[in-house]
Interface confidence: low
């Protein structure tokens, strides 16, 4: 039976040529984590493989760097980066957790960057 | 648990360098991972650079060129040198793992 659930960043927005942190975290499972997928819509952007580490697709690996931790940080955002974004835990025995992030980039300055994230 | 502690933080004039060093400790599923952040007063925390397994990095723009980033595999350490400091890079500075952060070591550039 899958007993975690997926806390996302939600949706968010931030500004053209700017960067913003994707971020997701698995909760409520003693599952394994074995891989974690990020795609957008249907391209594959990175792969984070508990054996083989990182591998970032090789059509974003100037704009797309790993971290923090399991999230994801887009930079040099355009307009064309608005759209869905999907963390995909792979996890044993559970199976698979999706969680959506929707990221809207502005042209205006006093676009809210919406992933903060507080020191522990 | 991981811990990870921060080290190397200090005054320096502008136009000076800075080694940052960065300890962890503990399991982490990160795929050898190790990043840099860092977060001015009134500001939000912002991506510096990363460090894979394998000697992959990555930088933000306003440090490309000035700051190097490595990784010591065998003591699970990371590394930030920071040349041509400039008062604008006055931040605690922040490591990164699986999802852990350690406190933070304070950099100020100022003459």
């Known amino acids: 039976m899958m007993t975690g659930t997926i806390e996302t960043t939600g949706n968010i927005s931030a500004e053209k040529g700017g960067s913003i942190i994707l971020q997701c975290h698995l909760s409520s499972t003693t599952a394994q984590v074995t891989q974690v997928n990020w795609e957008q819509q249907d391209q594959l952007l990175a792969i984070c493989n508990a054996d083989l580490g990182w591998h970032i697709s090789p059509s974003f690996k100037d704009r797309v760097a790993p971290g923090p931790g399991l999230g994801l940080t887009l930079q040099s955002l355009t307009v064309n980066d608005t759209g869905e974004y999907f963390c995909i835990y792979h996890t044993y025995p559970d199976g698979t957790y999706t969680g959506r992030i929707f990221l809207e980039v502005l042209e205006s300055s006093v676009a809210e960057h919406g992933a903060r994230f507080q020191i522990p | 648990e991981v811990q990870l502690v921060e080290s190397g933080g200090g005054l320096v004039q502008p136009g000076g360098s800075l080694r940052l060093s960065c300890a962890a400790s503990?399991?982490?599923?990160?795929?050898?991972?190790m990043g840099w952040f860092r977060q001015a007063p009134g500001k939000e925390r912002e991506w510096v650079a990363s460090?894979?397994?394998?000697?992959?990095?990555w930088y933000a723009d306003s440090v490309k060129g000035r700051f190097t980033i490595s990784a010591d595999n065998s003591k699970n350490t990371a590394y930030l040198q920071m040349n041509s400091l400039k008062p604008e890079d006055t931040a605690v500075y922040y490591c990164?793992?699986?999802?852990?952060w350690g406190q933070g070591t304070l950099v100020t550039v100022s003459s």
């Open positions: 503990g399991n982490t599923f990160s795929g050898g991972f």
């Open positions: 990164d793992a699986a999802d852990y």
């Open positions: 460090v894979l397994r394998g000697g992959y990095t």
